[in-house]
Amino acid sequence: QRLPRMQEDSPLGGGSSGEDDPLGEEDLPSEEDSPREEDPPGEEDLPGEEDLPGEEDLPEVKPKSEEEGSLKLEDLPTVEAPGDPQEPQNNAHRDKEGDDQSHWRYGGDPPWPRVSPACAGRFQSPVDIRPQLAAFCPALRPLELLGFQLPPLPELRLRNNGHSVQLTLPPGLEMALGPGREYRALQLHLHWGAAGRPGSEHTVEGHRFPAEIHVVHLSTAFARVDEALGRPGGLAVLAAFLEEGPEENSAYEQLLSRLEEIAEEGSETQVPGLDISALLPSDFSRYFQYEGSLTTPPCAQGVIWTVFNQTVMLSAKQLHTLSDTLWGPGDSRLQLNFRATQPLNGRVIEASFPAGVDSSPRAAEPVQLNSCLAAGD
């Protein structure tokens, strides 16, 4: 059973209003909507000791002799900050203690490329998705998720890492992007805005959604995250936009109801296992896909991004709880934790469905400029 919380089949950008033009002018972002140059990238931080690595928390590497095959906090390398600053585009700051974990924030110095040179790479995330320019790829089959319906025990760790709220996932959650493209889920986290200000990382034709969920996966071809970092397809992230709907989303409520317990940066709690797939849209067949990067330092590239066409609906109260409960570094609210969209630089976004033909109500005529790169993969 799925809860009546999803927009059943509206194209990306569609609200719950059912209007013909859900991406009308009023939906285009104002200056406040998009982070300015100093409103940096994502929220994958270099976390505390037991954090599983992922887009959010990228820990330092301990000697490989410790449990060679297991995914531990130490699965991601420490990001060293090189000497010469590069583009002042996505800024982060180091902890006052100046430790090796390269604590950064949204906004502030130094620029992210100084924290990690990869943040200045050419194929970064997030991006603006323009359905009209997406290449329809019939070879992109429905996603397959196995083992995502977790029992209440063992409990899962829910943590405020100062950049997001992150749920560490246990072993056994398997995801396939297609034949031979198999992954294991590591963690999920959210990006959001502030009161009246949307906070998704990806945008659709410039439209920013209230929030976005990321489920971070490691390819089964790699035993450890540090081996997969920067390798094409080594990591994969499932992303879905969160929108306002009329009803409470009971799946999300299992997490949102616990945020008060972890309001303070660095705090954590344990929550009963839940159906992780219920946090995602129900339609696993319609999505956009492209190769990009982690949206926070170390900004490693080669990440396969899958962005669902269908959105997830949360109540207004739930979206408010998400954006108004947690605190980040320096006694500031944890809000607007999204990275500015990055240039495609020639990349083609692929779609598993003919997005440019019938799904974009704003299109005067279908324009299919790009051909599918995935055919035959």
Epitope: Q1, L3, Q149, P151, P152, L153, P154, E155, S250, Q254, T269, Q270, V271, P272, G273, L274, D275
Partner: antibody, heavy 124, light 107 residues
């Protein structure tokens, strides 16, 4: 034989305090999450609180009705569970049961071993 | 909180009857539901866990079924000992919640 024996109940005035104890035997106490469940006279069952095992950091969880007033704790060296009840209200009057919950080998919250209960009466 | 609604609240039956008690849950709890039996003046006893698994030592005349939001406890052939109160309990998330109880009485 697996056994849970509660003690410490009694009559107390509103605003007063009471400490319940539960002695466990016949199983590896340290492995289990432990709960308190209560039952008001003539009423149904209400979960009150639980405390996780050592492996999960002994962290507690409370129902909204007792949060901030009751404190659950355990002493694994004594195979004992406790419930410190402060600022007691008339509606806290109930039989309080010490209950064994899940452990690392289970995947689900159910209550498989119950004590005989101890009666708490809050009355002026 | 997850709401649990048992029906009927009282059930009149005779020895040897087959009876069914229903538990409706306010949201999907998969199979994370237990059934308990409570005799007057005694602590509850676990009968069924994970919707359909019989707890050790429980007679086979008791059975459970269901998933999602609808669950049933069936007693295949009522015995004199079975005329007591039964509770369902969800173990999906806390606060853990119980149904209000179903009293099985002799017709």
């Amino acid at each position: 034989e697996v056994q849970l024996v509660e003690s410490g109940g009694g009559l107390v005035q509103p605003g007063g305090s009471l400490r319940l104890s539960c002695a466990a035997s016949g199983f590896t106490f340290t492995d289990y999450y432990m709960h308190w469940v209560r039952q008001a006279p003539g009423k149904g069952l209400e979960w009150v609180a639980f405390i996780r095992n050592k492996a999960s950091g002994y962290t507690p969880q409370y129902s909204a009705s007792v949060k901030g007033r009751f404190t659950i704790s355990r002493d694994d060296s004594k195979n004992s569970l406790y419930l410190q009840m402060n600022s007691l209200k008339i509606e806290d009057t109930a039989v309080y049961y010490c209950v064994r919950g899940g452990h690392a080998g289970s995947n689900y919250w159910y209550f498989d071993v119950w004590g005989q209960g101890t009666t708490v009466t809050v009355s002026s | 909180d997850i709401q649990m609604t048992q029906s009927p609240s009282t059930l009149s039956a005779s020895v040897g009857d087959r009876v069914t008690i229903t538990c409706h849950v306010s949201q999907n709890i998969n199979v994370w539901l237990s059934w308990y039996q409570q005799k007057p003046g005694n602590a509850p006893k676990l009968l069924i866990y994970q919707a359909s698994n019989l707890h050790t030592g429980v007679p086979s005349r008791f059975s459970g079924s269901g998933s999602g939001t609808e669950f049933t406890l069936t007693i295949g052939s009522l015995q004199p000992d079975d005329f007591v109160t039964y509770y369902c309990q969800q173990g999906q998330s806390y606060p853990f919640t119980f149904g209000q109880g179903t009293k099985v009485e002799i017709k």
